[in-house]
Interface confidence: low
């Protein structure tokens, strides 16, 4: 799967979305960073989102079918805090921070894991959680989003993600799929969908849908590997495509992305 040119910050500040902390038991989350990008770049990125969202609303008003066909899926892949762990630990990594694909085309949320022992068939679990805030609605008001981010910076909590961090009781939570050994089982809500876990832990949608927007958590469970960071998440956002999307988003690839 190719990585697009528009870089979104990842936790721990490293380009691959993870950083090794030498003192695992005491390691703490690091802020979400815009590496090499100043506030103007961030505002330009938010404006591009708003333009795309605006295109979606206009398209639905005039040509709803065409808007559906030409919709774009934006995937922000954000890595949970990653630390080195002592022996007998699982480390789960969601890589590739940002991808763009066309709606109804396949998308893969890559998830990798490392184990320090050899478990008997670790279980891979992908869960869906709806956004805590409406990302698309916020895209219509880039200034408010900017103000919100500035407020967070001022509050000394730049790593806070208002779209992801909230209690499960106030959002929808579903099991998408689980994999143990060679067998993949889809959650009840996703029965009939062409979704699977490929390789060891990548979540693959043969066709994306509007309702797929949300946060996807990849977790790996093993009775023999109890410590470490066994979960990472990816944000999947479905937006409308405007005719100028290629100019708005450097590195945009208008075609299916392979698993």
């Amino acid at each position: 799967m190719q990585q697009d040119g528009l870089g979104v910050g990842t936790r721990n500040g490293s380009g691959k979305g993870r950083s090794v902390h030498p003192s695992w038991p005491w390691c703490a989350p690091r802020p979400l960073r815009y590496f090499g990008r100043d506030a103007r770049a961030r505002r330009a990125q938010t404006a591009a989102m708003a333009l795309l969202a605006g295109g979606l609303s206009r398209g639905l008003g005039s040509h709803p079918a065409a808007a559906g066909r030409d919709a774009v899926v934006f995937v922000w892949l954000l890595l949970s805090t990653w630390c080195t762990a002592p022996a007998r630990a699982i480390q789960v990594t969601v890589s590739n921070p940002y991808h763009v694909v066309i709606l109804f085309q396949p998308v893969t949320l890559p998830c990798t894991y490392q184990m320090t022992s050899t478990p008997t068939q670790p279980i891979v679990i992908w869960k869906y959680k709806s956004f805590c805030r409406d990302r698309i609605a916020d895209a219509f008001s880039p200034a408010s989003v900017d103000n919100q981010l500035n407020a967070q910076l001022a509050a000394g909590n730049p790593g806070y993600n208002p779209y992801v961090e909230c209690q499960d009781s106030v959002r929808t939570v579903r099991v998408v799929a689980t994999k143990q050994g060679n067998a993949v089982t889809l959650g009840d809500y996703y029965q009939g969908r062409r979704i699977t876990i490929t390789g060891n832990a990548d979540l693959t949608f043969d066709q994306t849908a509007w309702g797929d927007s949300g946060v996807y958590y990849c977790s790996v469970v093993s009775a023999q590997d109890l410590q470490g960071n066994n979960e990472a998440y990816a944000e999947l956002i479905v937006l409308g495509r405007t005719s100028g999307v290629a100019e708005l988003l450097p590195g945009f690839q208008a075609g299916p992305i392979e698993d």
């Epitope: 990798t112 184990m115 050899t118 062409r194 699977t196 949608f205 043969d206």
Partner: antibody
């Protein structure tokens, strides 16, 4: 019980095309990756191609890259291997197999390119 | 390709170990499977998959283990009917992999 039944083998002409079909039963077909593996007479096993459970990801061995197409129909629980521009070295028994790390095999179908 | 010995021999009742190395480090872990072929042209039978998982119809004398990037198939109390060629299998991010096969003579 898991069963994998291959068909479509036989005598083939060099330069021609081959279409092998594997019919699966006894398990949730769409939940499993599927593979084609072949064995030339007197030789070892050679991985040919694989396809993910939903069908969106395909992989091919270097010997057939550019000549082979693997596809699947989850509604019919079938996986197909299309091999074009046949060569003498494509001769062998072709097996359909289940899983990324194979845990079940078909009985095989013999292909002779001559 | 995967590396495994060309042949091993044992007397009935003995314990046999066949090793395999060179598997792909796929998603940070090495995974292997083991397949038994009793005669050329006959269908292989999987005796171990995912390093140490044994299909329900395979006798318990077959077991698998992995240390680092090397996998081992162990047959405890080998029997005459275990005489066969054993292939190890693995995969990496782009391809399936097989060893050349180990001929077990009992």
């Amino acid at each position: 019980a898991v069963t994998l039944d291959e068909s479509g083998g036989g005598l083939q002409t060099p330069g021609g095309a081959l279409s092998l079909v594997c019919e699966a039963s006894g398990f949730d077909f769409s939940s499993h990756e599927m593979q084609w593996v072949r064995q030339a007479p007197g030789k070892g096993l050679e991985w040919v191609a694989g396809i993910s459970g939903a069908g969106s990801s395909t992989r091919y061995g270097s010997a057939v890259q550019g000549r082979a197409t693997i596809s699947r129909d989850n509604g019919q629980s079938t996986v197909r291997l299309q091999l074009n521009n046949l060569r003498a070295e494509d001769t062998g028994t072709y097996y359909c197999a289940r899983g990324s790390l194979i845990d079940a095999w078909g009985h095989g179908t013999e292909v002779i390119v001559s | 390709a995967l590396t495994q010995p060309a042949s091993v021999s044992a007397n009935p009742g003995e314990t046999v170990k066949i090793t395999c190395s060179g598997g792909g480090s796929y998603y940070g872990s090495y995974y292997y499977s083991w397949h038994q072929q009793k005669s050329p042209g006959s269908a292989p039978v999987t005796v171990i998959y995912e390093n140490n998982q044994r299909p329900s119809d395979i006798p318990s004398r077959f077991s698998g283990s992995k240390s680092g990037s090397t996998a081992t198939l162990t047959i405890t109390g080998v029997q005459a009917e275990d005489e066969a060629v054993y292939f190890c299998g693995s995969y990496d991010s782009s391809a399936g992999l097989f060893g050349a096969g180990t001929t077990l003579t009992v």
